[in-house]
């Protein structure tokens, strides 16, 4: 059993048919040494009296607010939760495996530049008593610090029968250099509780490697005489590093109809501007990625060709 | 300790060419040892990731942009000196801080071509010959240094007496590639960013 | 299987035209751009032009502009090329080859050999 | 016009021994560069596309690497059927163009 914050303790169970589970001592947080009776949640049944109660946990039944009183009046609380571990494995059920880059990815992120600033994103279908608490920190040894805002519901989508809910989080590293070379990870933890269930999800990247720039912006099409080219142009999104000299982007130009399965033109170029066939009922589309370390590529910026 | 604007006339920077190599070189070599050695440790997320040049250099410090001298997580009090005397800088006016910058970045790839020829030699005694370093990515890195042509003393490559422990050698290859390849995109952009200035 | 199959060799006369045709079968023709691509013996590969079968865009590479017409009919899937006041420098094997990406080829006919000799 | 040049013009190489072919272009073409074999009598075959990407069907001991305007193409062990001709072609603007071609012959 460890405490996971004031008043709130979590107890870690090898979850498995007719486990004997965990025998855990609680004690009244009170100077009284005598007359104090135990309940657990809403119930009026007394579950023992004494300034200790000892009882033993096996199953959710076991879990929740257990409450000290003497005479009527409340004199502590302390909240269990529990923690499975089944067949040496933590259990993952709060939150849903994005199965992407790989399998058992709960936890997403990504930065826009490299500021130091990043954003986490995960997924569950549970709506409601589910509360998510994060941190972070640069290395695990001597951490250095980030500083993690609330995780905030940020989606809602319908995938088939179910709803699935969308939370993230941001956070900021505190002493970012944009030029630094990383040797020790970004390390972020996300405590998940949902009704007495407990559960932790941990990620462990470097900026370099979640950098995904916003799309460009402020793309113009420009004609080209006697020719059916058109010379489209763009600039680099405001959140993406400077100097851009320094942080460079490449781009891919590209001009396809609605459906992925049509013809399409495409080119990289390292510049601002290229040279592309466009079509009637075609867009042209143009997307960026870090120059000299491969990482995600931007989404795309669209107009149309005609 | 940073890049001034007052740098080369654009497009009279012989070392862009050579650092685009250098990265693309050191990239191919990282992605053969990752499938080469394919059941070792070689990840990203699977080694330590050290710096040879640590406490001996300071690349990022000494090569840091202008524009980023006003944040003060960049600037390190790491203070070392070196050489100032390189043909990349293709400009008179070329500042003090510059050749600090490029010879900064010399050291680096000179540290990083003795450790490479080292441990090619032991891979070449590898009975399974599973994996040598690729000739190219050492000739880049010969190429880039006789492009910044400093001058410095020739540091000895290391010979051991003892058997080597190939898997030792093939990890510790792994770890020095992903920090090469870290330090060669620092570099990529530094020479990018002298070009353009 | 996608496929393009062109026409029988060709022997012309200096100043005249040739058209070489290409068939394609297997996916719709108009989802592919078509190239036409010629090697002379023993040389390489010059590319000529193109042809949008979908709306009949064309680009031709400057060096035959003007003597170098693409063209291509919907209903029986073939694309043509003719090429006007020929030379015994033409003396090539024209090859049409096709993709759904502009700028390079996936799928190649398999050659037509055209010859100019007076 | 982007003018694509080849080395070595031609390679001789032992059976099972790696091969590399060289393709330099005239000006910066990012990576918009393909590569084709082609053997005697037979029309070309695409190989890798933008520089590095692998073409479905194609052996895996065919790669190709490089941007801006050094390019290669490497086999890493050269079988019997793969002794031909190999052409570079960059797609950064048109005219398209390819390269003068690289003869794989056996040593």
């Known amino acids: 059993i460890w405490e996971l914050k004031k008043d709130v303790y979590v107890v870690e169970l090898d979850w498995y048919p007719d486990a004997p589970g965990e025998m855990v001592v609680l004690t009244c947080d009170t100077p009284e040494e005598d007359g104090i009776t135990w309940t657990l949640d809403q119930s009026s049944e007394v579950l023992g009296s004494g300034k200790t109660l000892t009882i033993q946990v096996k199953e959710f039944g076991d879990a929740g607010q257990y409450t000290c009183h003497k005479g009527g009046e409340v004199l502590s609380h302390s909240l269990l939760l529990l923690h499975k571990k089944e067949d040496g494995i933590w259990s993952t059920d709060i939150l849903k495996d994005q199965k992407e880059p790989k399998n058992k990815t709960f936890l997403r992120c990504e930065a826009k530049n490299y500021s130091g600033r990043f954003t986490c994103w995960w997924l569950t279908t549970i709506s409601t008593d589910l509360t998510f608490s994060v941190k972070s920190s640069r290395g695990s040894s001597d951490p250095q610090g980030v500083t993690c805002g609330a995780a905030t519901l940020s989606a809602e989508r319908v995938r088939g029968d179910n709803k699935e809910y969308e939370y993230s989080v941001e956070c900021q590293e505190d002493s970012a250099c944009p030029a630094a070379e990383e040797s020790l990870p970004i390390e972020v933890m996300v405590d998940a509780v949902h009704k007495l269930k407990y559960e932790n999800y941990t990620s462990s990247f470097f900026i370099r490697d979640i950098i995904k720039p916003d799309p460009p912006k402020n793309l113009q099409l420009k004609p080209l005489k006697n020719s059916r080219q058109v010379e489209v142009s763009w600039e680099y999104p405001d959140t993406w590093s400077t100097p851009h000299s320094y942080f460079s982007l490449t781009f891919c130009v590209q001009v396809q109809g609605k459906s992925k399965r049509e013809k399409k033109d495409r080119v990289f170029t390292d510049k601002t501007s290229a040279t592309v066939i466009c079509r009637k009922n075609a867009s042209i589309s143009v997307r960026a990625q870090d120059r000299y370390y491969s990482s995600s590529w931007s989404e795309w910026a669209s107009v149309p060709c005609s | 300790r940073n890049l001034p604007v007052a740098t080369p006339d654009p497009g009279m920077f012989p070392c862009l060419h050579h650092s685009q190599n250098l990265l693309r070189a050191v990239s191919n070599m990282l992605q053969k040892a990752r499938q080469t050695l394919e059941f070792y440790p070689c990840t990203s997320e699977e080694i330590d990731h050290e710096d040879i040049t640590k406490d001996k250099t300071s690349t990022v410090e000494a090569c840091l942009p202008l524009e980023l001298t006003k944040n003060e997580s960049c600037l390190n009090s790491r203070e070392t000196s070196f050489i100032t005397n390189g043909s990349c800088l293709a400009s008179r006016k070329t500042s003090f801080m510059m050749a600090l910058c490029l010879s900064s970045i010399y050291e680096d790839l000179k540290m990083y071509q003795v450790e490479f020829k080292t441990m090619n030699a032991k891979l070449l005694m590898d009975p399974k010959r599973q994996i040598f370093l690729d000739q190219n990515m050492l000739a880049v890195i010969d190429e880039l240094m006789q492009a910044l042509n400093f001058n410095s003393e020739t540091v000895p490559q290391k010979s051991s007496l003892e058997e080597p422990d190939f898997y030792k050698t093939k990890i510790k290859l792994c770890i020095l590639l992903h920090a090469f390849r870290i330090r060669a995109v620092t570099i990529d952009r530094v020479m990018s960013y002298l070009n353009a200035s | 299987q996608v496929q393009l199959v062109q026409s029988g060799a060709e022997v012309k006369k200096p100043g005249s035209s040739v058209k070489v045709s290409c068939k394609a079968s297997?996916?719709?023709?108009?989802?592919?751009?078509l190239h036409w691509v010629r090697q002379a013996p023993g040389q390489g590969l010059e590319w000529m032009g193109w042809?949008?079968?979908?709306?009949?865009?064309?680009e031709y590479a400057p060096k035959f502009q003007g003597r170098v017409t693409i063209t291509a009919d919907e209903s029986t899937s073939t694309a043509y090329m003719e090429l006007s006041s020929l030379r015994s420098e033409d003396t090539a094997v024209y090859m049409c080859?096709?993709?759904?990406?502009?700028?390079?080829?996936?799928?190649w006919g398999q050659g037509t050999l055209v010859t100019v000799s007076s | 016009d982007i003018v694509m040049t080849q080395s070595p013009l031609s390679l001789p190489v032992t059976p099972g021994e790696p091969a590399s072919i060289s393709c330099r272009a005239s000006q910066s073409i990012s990576i918009n560069l393909h590569w084709y074999q082609q053997k005697p009598g037979q029309q070309p075959r695409l190989l890798i596309a933008f520089a590095s990407q692998s073409i479905s069907g194609v052996p895996s001991r065919f790669s190709g690497s490089g941007s801006g305007t050094d390019f290669t193409l490497t086999i890493s062990s050269l079988q019997p059927e793969d002794f031909a001709t190999y052409y570079c072609q960059q797609s950064n603007s048109f005219p398209l163009t390819f390269g003068q071609g690289t003869k794989v012959e056996i040593k």
């Open positions: 080859a096709r993709n759904k990406e502009l700028r390079y080829f996936d799928v």
């Open positions: 042809i949008d079968p979908e709306n009949g865009d064309t």
């Open positions: 297997g996916g719709t023709f108009s989802d592919y751009y």
